[in-house]
Structure formats: structure tokens, C-alpha cells
């Protein structure tokens, strides 16, 4: 059985303030069952950016339909970027449970925010 991998192909992404940023992420397997979550930063101080199954994340849109069977694309688009959004974003696979258990993280994508062109 092939080990699950979480792939974030871009090491860095740069966008202008006010624009949208696309952060790409794919998984190599649908197994085990469980959600993907996106975080900014690592460790206990990390910020939850998007949870596939719960919560309301108004600036975040999944690029692919998360309800589609066999979907392994967990890329997201964050709208209306501000300087406070700068940082490294991690796509993290969890195993379903109570609570969910963190299984595997992508390598991270650094988002840098350029000043809005005047």
C-alpha cells in the first residue's frame, strides 16, 4: 500500500494586496478517510485558515468541488489578501476520529504580499 503524500508544488507564491492567492495542494491517496485542513504557520500558534468539514471561512474557496467523489485536489483560493496574510501555509491531512488525528503535512507554501500598485 502506497504511503499517503501531501504535495504542495509551489514553495512560494507572491500576490498584490487586495488580490486573490491560490495555494495548491494534492493528496496521493483517498485513504485513510478524514478531512484536509489548511494552516498558516506551524506549532501551537498556527492559524486555522480552512477546514474542509466544519466552520465558516468566508475568504477561502476550494478550487475543486470538495463533495466530488475521489477528489484529491485540496487547493484553496484566498480572496482580498492583506499584509497580515503573509506567511507559510500548510495543507494538512487528518484521520477521521474524535478528535481527528493529524497524519501528514505538505511542505508549505510561503505567501508574500506585495504593495498594491497605485
Amino acid at each position: 500500500e502506497e504511503e499517503l503524500q501531501v504535495i504542495q508544488p509551489e514553495k512560494s507564491v507572491s500576490v498584490a494586496a487586495g488580490e486573490s492567492a491560490t495555494l495548491n495542494c494534492t493528496a496521493t491517496s483517498l485513504i485513510p478517510v478524514g478531512p484536509i485542513q489548511w494552516f498558516r504557520g506551524v506549532g501551537p500558534g498556527r492559524e486555522l485558515i480552512y477546514h474542509q468539514k466544519e466552520g465558516h471561512f468566508p475568504r477561502v474557496t476550494p478550487v475543486s468541488d470538495p463533495t466530488k467523489r475521489n477528489n484529491m485536489d485540496f487547493s484553496i483560493r484566498i480572496s482580498n489578501i492583506t499584509p497580515a496574510d503573509a506567511g507559510t501555509y500548510y495543507c494538512v491531512k487528518f484521520r477521521k476520529g474524535s478528535p481527528d488525528v493529524e497524519l501528514k503535512s505538505g511542505a508549505g507554501t510561503e505567501l508574500s504580499v506585495r504593495a498594491k500598485p497605485s
Epitope: G41, P44, R46, E47, L48, E54, G55, H56, N80, A84
Partner: antibody, heavy 119, light 108 residues
Framework: DVQLVESGGGVVRPGESLRLSCAAS????????MNWVRQAPGEGLEWVSR????????DYADSVKGRFTISRDNSKNTLYLQMNSLRAEDTAVYYC????????????WGLGALVTVSS | ETVLTQSPATLSVSPGERATLSCRAS??????LAWHQQKPGQAPRLLIY???NRATGIPDRFSGSGSGTDFTLTISSPQTEDSAVYYC??????????FGGGTKVEIK
């Protein structure tokens, strides 16, 4: 309906401690950053502290840094503010406020808890 | 650190007479500005976010405009229940989150 209800306010002497609680309901508490904002009598709003959704990331206003500690218990849907070494200038109504998303405005406010520091 | 300056400090208008409140930021905050209403003895309530979007349940007599450093909250036809203090809040740069000093609106 989102509800935020503060408790734990009261009258204390300078140098004493107090712990405020904010009970949250009507939303997925563990998914949202939360804040404390205070308002001294007859004054405007002053942001005090923020905690991220998981509880491991905190920020403080310079005026309370080192004296106040924000925390949360996601299993109890409750936000806390531990206030130590209280000063007269900490007298205020303390509001808990939910963030719309992690990097955003405050979309819901509690009713507030009055803290009075007086000798 | 971004400073928000609100003017005027007090605004007295008659019912039905347009009220215009200003909030100026010391540096650009893009469109990341919210307005909150606080009636006497009550908690603040979100009115407008992202400079111009009305929050859920807010009457359409309230509108927001502006971007960058200059923002306006307009109450097109104020009612007596609109007597309150109005605060702007920026969330472009943080921490700290900053509020303006407030504008007190009195309906004559």
C-alpha cells in the same frame, strides 16, 4: 444564533487578580479566533487581546502585556481572560468578540462584564 | 501602527436628515475597515465590513464607502433609534487591532 456571555466581573483592589469567562454558543467555537476588548467609563473601545482558534497563538495590547493571559477551552466553548496585578486604569467593561475569520473584523460581541479596580 | 481618526466627535441631526461620519487612517488599510454601532448601555454591534458591505440584519439606510485612508459611514435618513456612538475598526495591519475614537450621533 451566535451568543457570547461574559461572567466573572466584579470589584477588586489594586494588585489583585480576576478571571473573566466568555461562554460561546451558536457557532463552531473551535474554528474561530476570539478577542477581548475593553471600554473604560465614558471612553472608547480598546482592543486587549486575541487568541487563535487552536489556543496556541496569542497577542496582547502593550498596556496589559505581562499581566493578562488569554486562553480558551474548546471542549467547553469558553474563552478566558486571567487578569493579574490589576490597576485602577484597568477599570472597564470587558467584551469578548468573535472574529469573522482569522484575519478579519469582529462580527459578534458579548454583553460585557464590568471590572472595577478600586482601593 | 495605524491610527484611525474619526470626525466629527459629535453630530446632531434631525430625523430624516442625512448623517455623514468620517474615519481617516494614518496609512492605507485597503478596504479592511468596519463600522460598529454602540447604543447607550449596550454592547457594540457590527454594521459595515470591508468598507461597504452591510452586516446581516442592518437596515439599508446605513451605507459605507471609501478605500485606502478615507472612509465614510452614511445614515441616509436617521431614525431616533440610530442615536449611538459609531466606531471604525481597521484590520489590515494587526496586532494591535485599532478602533477610532468614535462619533456620537444625536437625533434631535
Amino acid at each position: 444564533d451566535v451568543q457570547l456571555v461574559e461572567s466573572g466581573g466584579g470589584v477588586v483592589r489594586p494588585g489583585e487578580s480576576l478571571r473573566l469567562s466568555c461562554a460561546a454558543s451558536g457557532f463552531s467555537f473551535r474554528s474561530y479566533a476570539m478577542n477581548w476588548v475593553r471600554q473604560a467609563p465614558g471612553e472608547g473601545l480598546e482592543w486587549v487581546s486575541r487568541i487563535n482558534s487552536g489556543g496556541g497563538g496569542t497577542d496582547y495590547a502593550d498596556s496589559v502585556k505581562g499581566r493578562f493571559t488569554i486562553s480558551r477551552d474548546n471542549s467547553k466553548n469558553t474563552l478566558y481572560l486571567q487578569m493579574n496585578s490589576l490597576r485602577a486604569e484597568d477599570t472597564a467593561v470587558y467584551y469578548c468578540a468573535k472574529q469573522y475569520d482569522w484575519n478579519s473584523f469582529f462580527d459578534y460581541w458579548g454583553l460585557g462584564a464590568l471590572v472595577t479596580v478600586s482601593s | 501602527e495605524t491610527v484611525l481618526t474619526q470626525s466629527p466627535a459629535t453630530l446632531s441631526v434631525s430625523p430624516g436628515e442625512r448623517a455623514t461620519l468620517s474615519c481617516r487612517a494614518s496609512q492605507t488599510v485597503g478596504s479592511k475597515l468596519a463600522w460598529h454601532q454602540q447604543k447607550p448601555g449596550q454592547a457594540p454591534r457590527l454594521l459595515i465590513y470591508d468598507a461597504s458591505n452591510r452586516a446581516t440584519g442592518i437596515p439599508d439606510r446605513f451605507s459605507g464607502s471609501g478605500s485606502g485612508t478615507d472612509f465614510t459611514l452614511t445614515i441616509s435618513s436617521p431614525q431616533t433609534e440610530d442615536s449611538a456612538v459609531y466606531y471604525c475598526q481597521q484590520y489590515y495591519y494587526w496586532p494591535p487591532y485599532r478602533f477610532g475614537g468614535g462619533t456620537k450621533v444625536e437625533i434631535k
